[in-house]
């Protein structure tokens, strides 16, 4: 089934105009056409979209729960964002899977020079990694603090112990 | 208790809470608590979740309001992580599951995520963690050393 026909003729709440709007907005955020956006700019991007694809701010937690794949450098591919937003509107269904496959095939065929990418984490995993990193960092800073306090205490005792020898 | 949280943390918790408060009545069900916490990067076990619910859901009606949730999160953030919890945190970055993290990966994580360490702090950390200087950190030993009283 041709993607244009599939979206235009169906009674679904998403049409060709919505996808065009997505790509027009995308161009502003990715002027060099890399197909990727920095995770740090994702919140602004989805807030800038028009309904029904828009996710208005505050949206950071919502974007985490979308569990978007990320590649090295904390970048997210435009198709993964579009799929996730489409899924939010259409829900999880066989129709959604078919639409995703069609969109992916069309996209890859239309951009045959683009290198395929290997996601290494997701927005949900990244949030968990952030929390785990903080645990390690706090534990290490506590360790540094305790060590410097021990050293200070040792120096203090040492200087006072030695003061009676003169 | 909640006054120990930063404004940014409270805003994040509010967003997570609202996201799962489907009917907008200002409460979430105790069943949804795990989902909310996972969206905030926490990975509580079922037993931990039950302990938290028992602490805050005093009337046992199966719902938690935002102030209760905030109190619970503040309590969780305030608690000093146990040796096992810190080991679990390291395990997240041990992609091969072999008990080691490369010094380079550790440096990357510590300087790019969370409450970023300074270059000086991370240099010191790696000096302590990579004892034999082979570029690999046995984090089990490192955690023991860090948490030793």
């Amino acid at each position: 089934e041709n993607f244009n026909v599939a979206t235009e003729e169906s009674s679904e709440p998403l049409g060709e105009d919505d996808f065009e709007m997505f790509y027009e907005t995308w161009e502003k955020f990715d002027p060099d056409a890399t197909q990727f956006i920095a995770y740090s700019r994702l919140s602004d991007f989805v807030d800038t979209l028009q309904e029904p694809l828009r996710i208005a701010k505050p949206n950071k937690i919502k974007l985490i729960t979308l569990d978007l794949p990320m590649v090295p450098g904390d970048k997210i591919h435009c198709l993964d964002i579009l799929f996730a937003l489409t899924k939010e509107v259409l829900g999880d269904s066989g129709e959604m899977d078919a639409l995703k496959q069609t969109m992916e095939e069309k996209f890859m065929a239309a951009n045959p020079s683009k290198v395929s990418y290997e996601p290494i984490t997701t927005t949900l995993k990244r949030k968990h990694e952030e929390v785990c990193a903080i645990k390690i960092q706090r534990a290490y800073r506590r360790h540094l603090l305790q060590r410097s306090m021990k050293q200070a205490s040792y120096m203090y005792r040492h200087s006072h112990d030695g003061s009676g020898d003169d | 208790m909640a006054d120990q949280l930063t404004e940014e943390q409270i805003a994040e918790f509010k967003e997570a809470f609202s996201l799962f408060d489907k009917d907008g009545d200002g409460t979430i069900t105790t069943k949804e608590l795990g989902t909310v916490m996972r969206s905030l990067g926490q990975n509580p076990t079922e037993a931990e979740l039950q302990d938290m619910i028992n602490e805050v859901d005093a009337d046992g009606n199966g719902t938690i309001d935002f102030p209760e949730f905030l109190t619970m999160m503040a309590r969780k953030m305030k608690d000093t992580d146990s040796e096992e919890e810190i080991r679990e945190a390291f395990r997240v970055f041990d992609k091969d599951g072999n008990g080691y993290i490369s010094a380079a990966e550790l440096r990357h994580v510590m300087t790019n995520l969370g409450e970023k360490l300074t270059d000086e702090e991370v240099d010191e950390m790696i000096r302590e963690a990579d004892i034999d200087g082979d570029g690999q950190v046995n984090y089990e030993e490192f955690v023991q050393m860090m948490t030793a009283k």
Partner: nanobody, 124 residues
Framework: QVQLQESGGGLVQTGGSLRLSCKAS????????LAWSRQAPGKQREFVAS????????YYSGSVKGRFTVSRDNAKETVYLQMNDLKPEDSAVYYC?????????????????WGRGTQVTVSS
Amino acid sequence: QVQLQESGGGLVQTGGSLRLSCKASGRAFARYDLAWSRQAPGKQREFVASIGVTRNPPYYSGSVKGRFTVSRDNAKETVYLQMNDLKPEDSAVYYCAAKDASVTVATIEDYPYWGRGTQVTVSS
């Protein structure tokens, strides 16, 4: 600006072969992604094959995979479509299209440069 001119179409019997050519003129050919698309009477234009500027393998639509081969010759500024084992349902006007490889588009329909097409008729 890139101009594209298709040739090589014609009438052929079922099971026969044709080789279409698309000659480009204008900007640096080697920088362009190239695609073949076709449109049968009363139907929507459909993607056939595409080839990029990198070593990525070409893309083909399911209906032509294994029968059609797309290739390019940068020195001759030409892209080819070798069509074997032709079927009546392959009858259509075949179009060549191009875009700068550094530009991302959603679908082939968004390619900015198109030829005028060449007719392929497969008789049974």
